[in-house]
Amino acid sequence: LVITPPGPELILNVSSTFVLTCSGSAPVVWERMSQELPQEMAKAQDNTFSSVLTLTNLTGLDTGEYFCTYNDSRGLEPDERKRLYIFVPDPTVGFLPNDAEELFIFLTEITEITIPCRVTDPQLVVTLHEKKGDIALPVPYDHQRGFSGIFEDRSYICKTTIGDREVDSDAYYVYRLQVSSINVSVNAVQTVVRQGENITLMCIVIGNEVVNFEWMYPRKESGRLVEPVTDFLLDMPYHIRSILHIPSAELEDSGTYTCNVTESVNDHQDEKAINITVVESGYVRLLGEVGALQFAELHRSRTLQVVFEAYPPPTVLWFKDNRTLGDSSAGEIALSTRNVSETRYVSELTLVRVKVAEAGHYTMRAFHEDAEVQLSFQLQINVPVRVLELSESHPDSGEQTVRCRGRGMPQPNIIWSACRDLKRCPRELPPMLLGNSSEEESQLETNVTYWEEEQEFEVVSTLRLQHVDRPLSVRCTLRNAVGQDMQEVIVVPHSLPFKEQKLISEEDLGGEQKLISEEDLHHHHHH
């Protein structure tokens, strides 16, 4: 590229006309401030191209950089672009006007910058000052560019004298921006909404002053744009939040909402997504199974838990035998429903030191204006077994009988066992089971009765022993799902002059003997 006259700096007179020519081996063009200028282009016989720029009626505002470049200058080397700087000294123009981008100088690190105050006359003496300050700052000045150096976060002005007139430039604001790597968080006021309700999402980025938010959302794909609002988070400088608000959601607004945040200074970016579901109407759905029969142990505390999903938040009521339950003042019942996630709830009924009377039919009902669900179960109060009576008798028939009576819920199993060697029982010799087998000379008769009011079973079992020829330790063990109890009696032969009975509780025996039940239930009564 060849420029005529070559420059690199020209000083031209106000109101004059001046012609600049640029030529090259391909089409060339004159540009100023990235804009093509009105010019005459030509192609010579020898395949050289030229462009003639005619500057007419020059004023100080024509001062500045002019470039000649190849027409398609993308990817060209720097030497394929020629720069020329023209001064047009003009006493009516003080400092060349700046646009807003030049007046506010943002930086992200301590680096040399240029305060671009430029004059039309290279002979003028220009000084730099803090705005409203008189002292000139010792910073080098280039008439084509301005003052270059490292500056503090302040406002600055340039001064010059044209004739006898002191002229000030606009103020320049130097400001360091807070920039760091980007970490985005996205959340929604709610991720499930009914149609007609609002969707509000927030995208937050911390530690950056220069961020661009871009939202991607289902409505955008159909060309319906929503204008986000950017603001600051409470008490946090550089906690910047973009809010996307979609009023009156439609079913089509369901989907993925993505917030993409970019920071142009260091080219950092991050994005996060969140799913929003728009439902036609509200819902309540049970999660998991709760068995139709539930158990609680007498005098222990029991918590019954129901998990469900709902939107909008439902009202939850508990009933027992169709009567509404509430937190009792005595603290026997506690009800609580807590939100474990946005739409998931856990409702709990806690019975403190369970009583027999608390058995019954329980229902939990969760409902709102759009839907309801209910769950029912029967609560059975389990009562550990107790042996209430163990007695031995010998009717005239010659056989000897032992009667064992006990209660519990659920229905107790009864196990009879005996031990012949009293000295070694029960530590060394395992007891033998008694029942209706032929080798045992014993018979067993068991009756079961259910007592409605006490809500428990009573078991009465009678053991008939045919031949007792030496002292025998007979044990009655009652067992159910929540415990066991036992008693022992010593049965002596008819021929012995005395009968010695000893009742032994389960605690005395250390609960060591674990025996499998053999039941012979002859009668099973309910009263």
């Epitope: 646009d99 400001y175 603001d231 008490d235 400088p237 910047i240």
Partner: antibody, heavy 127, light 107 residues
């Protein structure tokens, strides 16, 4: 040297209209946002409206929305406030001010205050 | 809209006193807060911008601090020229709001 001069204030009846002007000198007017601020007698300052360099963005205090209109002519270095449907409560001294709003850095504006003010022009709305 | 509340409304002080004026915003404004001084019959004068940056030409006895919702203007040693009314002003989302003002008068 850097100066703003307001004009156009007068006495006007409720429901009437008025156009205020503010002329700038000593700075590149076209590079700055500009604002109107008013002060009722014996009261505090109230921001009224502002306008971006190329008039693409204009904002108003709620109490004047739909009644007042801010505009500018960069060639004439002038700012205007067209006031219609005037009310008694619009009585005030109206100041124009240079608003230091840099170009957007990302998705929001920075702000450096109102650094140059005019001397004010008085608007009285009374029957 | 964001409200600014200044306290106190009036402050009586003597020359040489340290004076503090508080400005509270109804929601976060980061540090986009400016302070102005106004004397009777005059236009306001910018003292501080961006909560704590002193405007050029403003005496160093003036200082500002705070961010989010709580801001203060402090005059370290009150001078005769400082008796005036002081206003805070916020900028957020393109609108502006001024506080109701604090009048600093001679005790």
């Amino acid at each position: 040297q850097v100066q703003l001069v307001e004009s156009g204030g007068s006495l006007v009846q409720p429901g009437g209209s008025l156009r205020l002007a503010c002329t700038a000198s000593g700075f590149t007017f076209s590079s700055y946002w500009m604002s109107w601020v008013r002060q009722a007698p014996g009261k505090g300052l109230e921001w009224v409206a502002n306008i971006q360099q190329d008039e693409n963005e204009k904002y108003y205090v709620d109490s004047v929305k739909g009644r007042f209109s801010i505009s500018r002519d960069n060639a004439k270095k002038s700012l205007y406030l067209q006031m219609n449907s005037l009310r008694v409560e619009d009585t005030a001294v109206y100041f124009c001010a240079r608003d230091l709003v840099p170009p957007r850095q990302g998705d929001y504006y920075h702000y450096f205050g109102m650094d140059v003010w005019g001397q004010g022009t008085t608007v009285t709305v009374s029957s | 809209d964001i409200q600014l509340t200044q306290s106190p409304s009036t402050l009586s002080a003597s020359v040489g006193d340290r004076v503090t004026i508080t400005c509270r915003a109804s929601q976060s404004i980061s540090d986009w807060l400016a302070w102005y001084q106004q004397k009777p019959g005059k236009a306001p004068n910018l003292l501080i911008y961006k909560a704590s940056t002193l405007e050029s030409g403003v005496p160093s006895r003036f200082s500002g601090s705070g961010s989010g919702t709580e801001f203060t203007l402090t005059i370290s040693s009150l001078q005769p020229d400082d008796f005036a009314t002081y206003y805070c002003q916020q900028y957020n989302s393109y609108s502006r709001t001024f506080g109701q003002g604090t009048k600093v008068e001679i005790k």
